[in-house]
Amino acid sequence: HNTTVFQGVAGQSLQVSCPYDSMKHWGRRKAWCRQLGEKGPCQRVVSTHNLWLLSFLRRWNGSTAITDDTLGGTLTITLRNLQPHDAGLYQCQSLHGSEADTLRKVLVEVLADPLDHRDAGDLWFPGESESFEDAHVEHSISRSLLEGEIPFPPTS
């Protein structure tokens, strides 16, 4: 899977979308997990409703919410009041029994609030040692696409 980058502003909300084939993943609950290290496990943050039929209901765990459009095939995660410590690598997952299939790998970046003049030294960006060569950036800040930029994130 390629990694898709979503950028949000500290203190604001960030919405992450994970498209999927609704027929392929029919009846399957979804989850949002945080990758612990490059090869480490993915720690569950929040999952959709226990009853798949009710997956459209938003479920919260702390400041993170998840909702699933099972017909349209879009999983949406909302990170409310984004903080520097929220930055990192995540996954959208489709659950099947004890299995979890990766729908999308997501890199969350937290940008400094331009109205906040405090030291931005604790804001996290991927270091040079971390490889996200194929990453595609999706800004939560509205802007027009640059020439030649892909309008829709690549999926594999």
Epitope: D21, S22, M23, K24, W26, G27, R28, L51, W52, L53, L54, H96, G97, S98, E99
Partner: antibody, heavy 126, light 107 residues
Amino acid sequence: EVQLQQSGAELVKPGASVKISCKASGYAFSNYWMSWVKQRPGKGLEWIGQIYPGDGDTKYNGKFEGKATLTADKSSSTAYMQLSSLTSEDSAVYFCSREKGADYYGSTYSAWFSYWGQGTLVTVSA
Amino acid sequence: DIQMTQSPASLSVSVGETVTITCRTSENVYSNLAWYQQKQGKSPQLLVYAATNLADGVPSRFSASGSATQFSLKINSLQSADFGSYYCHHFWGTPYTFGGGTKLEMN
């Protein structure tokens, strides 16, 4: 009406390979997981693996990794299973079966097998 | 992998009798279990899905119950059409597995 039509019986030599087919009709072939099941003479059912024709994604029973290769051709709505390095242990009837999938709008997985092919007998003999 | 233990392996019964087949799974599969009937030389046919629901066209003399790790299939007033083999099957994640089967033979 959903139908799964499998290819005819095969007599193959030990060490050879065989490719059997399952032609689907009566539904959107790309949108449903297709499984393959093995049944040795007088024995029970064994799940080999499954393929999602929409994108070619496959899942295998570890026991059949390297033995079975699942493919699908969307243009002809046909699923295939190739069995390699055949031995007498591979002599069996092989069924293709389609999951219920999105025909069921309930609160559980819909991965039971609602539709089955008629079976293909593979005999491995010198 | 989830193991499935089906019992009895075979049963010699007469028309009109009541039969119960059980299936035990090594892990909780919730209600993600199906039952199939197979006649000699034929493909399996779906009898029960999601642990307790009868498939279309299945006679009401069949009933199924259970959840988690213990499941059963009951046939009341056995008919001649009911002889054959029965298999349970879990679909709680891959690899899917089947029970070893129960063969119903005429006494």
